[in-house]
Amino acid sequence: VQNSCDNCQPGTFCRKYNPVCKSCPPSTFSSIGGQPNCNICRVCAGYFRFKKFCSSTHNAECECIEGFHCLGPQCTRCEKDCRPGQELTKQGCKTCSLGTFNDQNGTGVCRPWTNCSLDGRSVLKTGTTEKDVVCGPPVVSFSPSTTISVTPEGGPGGHSLQVL
């Protein structure tokens, strides 16, 4: 004889000795029907805040408060955001290695400096862990009217003034 607990929907629990589908009590959930118990909802507090509230069928999801980022699966802990010159890995913030940079605050990866020579340009300003190399104009003969333009607009992740 098929156990009637098998027909229970998510958001309910069911005991085999009394096979009736019952709704999960408040602050609990079951994503699979027919289980003998509902699971206690996760609470997001301290450095955590709610990303998704708990429902009878889904656990709550947490994220970190401003200035912190998640580490671990399902955001098990919060760590202070990385600074420019670092990248966020699963092991936490790591300083960019020589020849790479990250100019973003709290996000982004360490990227290799631009190799100006590949685009036929010279290096105008060397790079750091926080800033890319700045390439000069193409290495060609210039007419008297040649100019170097400076753009004040913000770049990916918030670049400051850059020489094109």
Epitope: T89, G108, V109, T114, T151, G154, G155, P156, G157, Q162
Partner: antibody, heavy 121, light 107 residues
Framework: QVQLVQSGAEVKKPGASVKVSCKAS????????MHWVRQAPGQGLEWMGW????????NYAQKFQGRVTMTRDTSISTAYMELSRLRSDDTAVYYC??????????????WGQGTLVTVSS | ELELTQPPSVSVSPGQTASITCSAD??????ASWYQQKPGQSPVLVLY???KRPSGIPERISGSNSGNTATLTIRGTQPMDEADYYC?????????FGGGTRLTVLR
């Protein structure tokens, strides 16, 4: 809405060059890295490199260094990819793809429709 | 340089769960993304940072990444899920793609 519109199909002879354009709209062009990815017929995806549209900074996959040049024109929100010394095995669909902002590991959240480049004598 | 290895094909019956793997040495230390590509169309991002879904991607698509393997899971697979799937990561200044997996939904 975000859109990346690429130039039309090209047929080129071996040894020639091709320049593919990618016009961006619906977002701040200078705020996101632009990448180029190609796909040979019946094959997988192959990353070619990126350009930072704000600074013009580039990073090319080692395989394409010396043959590829990525540029942009911020006044018309357009990125370009030029591939020189074409060979028959460069026949592929070339995609521009926007790198998602504020994410890790460089995922591409929007893609152009692709440009078929055929290299044939 | 890291190499991402995917099975060339995976078959699944409608309504069943499909799992597509992507393997590389210590891949779990990195973040993986997944793309869906249907014939004649551009790729579409379906997962990033191992398990996050962009808006518009259904909850039945999920992901995990630990050890040497990242996994894309599609619950209640539908005919519309039939496509090529590519994993992708970032390693040593290079964007890497897996070779792709053709997901076939059996009729």
């Amino acid at each position: 809405q975000v859109q990346l519109v690429q130039s039309g199909a090209e047929v080129k002879k071996p040894g020639a060059s091709v320049k593919v354009s990618c016009k961006a709209s619906g977002y701040t062009f200078t705020g996101y890295y632009m990448h180029w990815v190609r796909q040979a017929p019946g094959q997988g995806l192959e990353w070619m490199g990126w350009i930072n549209p704000q600074s013009g900074g580039t990073n090319y996959a080692q395989k394409f260094q010396g043959r590829v040049t990525m540029t942009r024109d911020t006044s018309i929100s357009t990125a370009y990819m030029e591939l020189s010394r074409l060979r028959s095995d460069d026949t592929a669909v070339y995609y521009c793809a926007r790198e998602g902002g504020e994410w890790l590991a460089i995922p591409f959240d929007y893609w152009g429709q692709g440009t078929l480049v055929t290299v044939s004598s | 340089e890291l190499e991402l290895t995917q099975p060339p094909s995976v078959s699944v019956s409608p309504g069943q769960t499909a799992s597509i793997t992507c393997s590389a040495d210590k891949l779990g230390d990195k973040y993986a993304s997944w793309y869906q590509q249907k014939p004649g169309q551009s790729p579409v991002l379906v997962l990033y940072e191992d398990s996050k879904r962009p808006s518009g991607i259904p909850e039945r698509i999920s992901g995990s990444n630990s050890g040497n393997t990242a996994t894309l899971t599609i619950r209640g697979t539908q005919p519309m899920d039939e496509a090529d799937y590519y994993c992708q990561t970032w390693d040593t200044n290079t964007v890497l793609f897996g070779g792709g997996t053709r997901l076939t939904v059996l009729r």
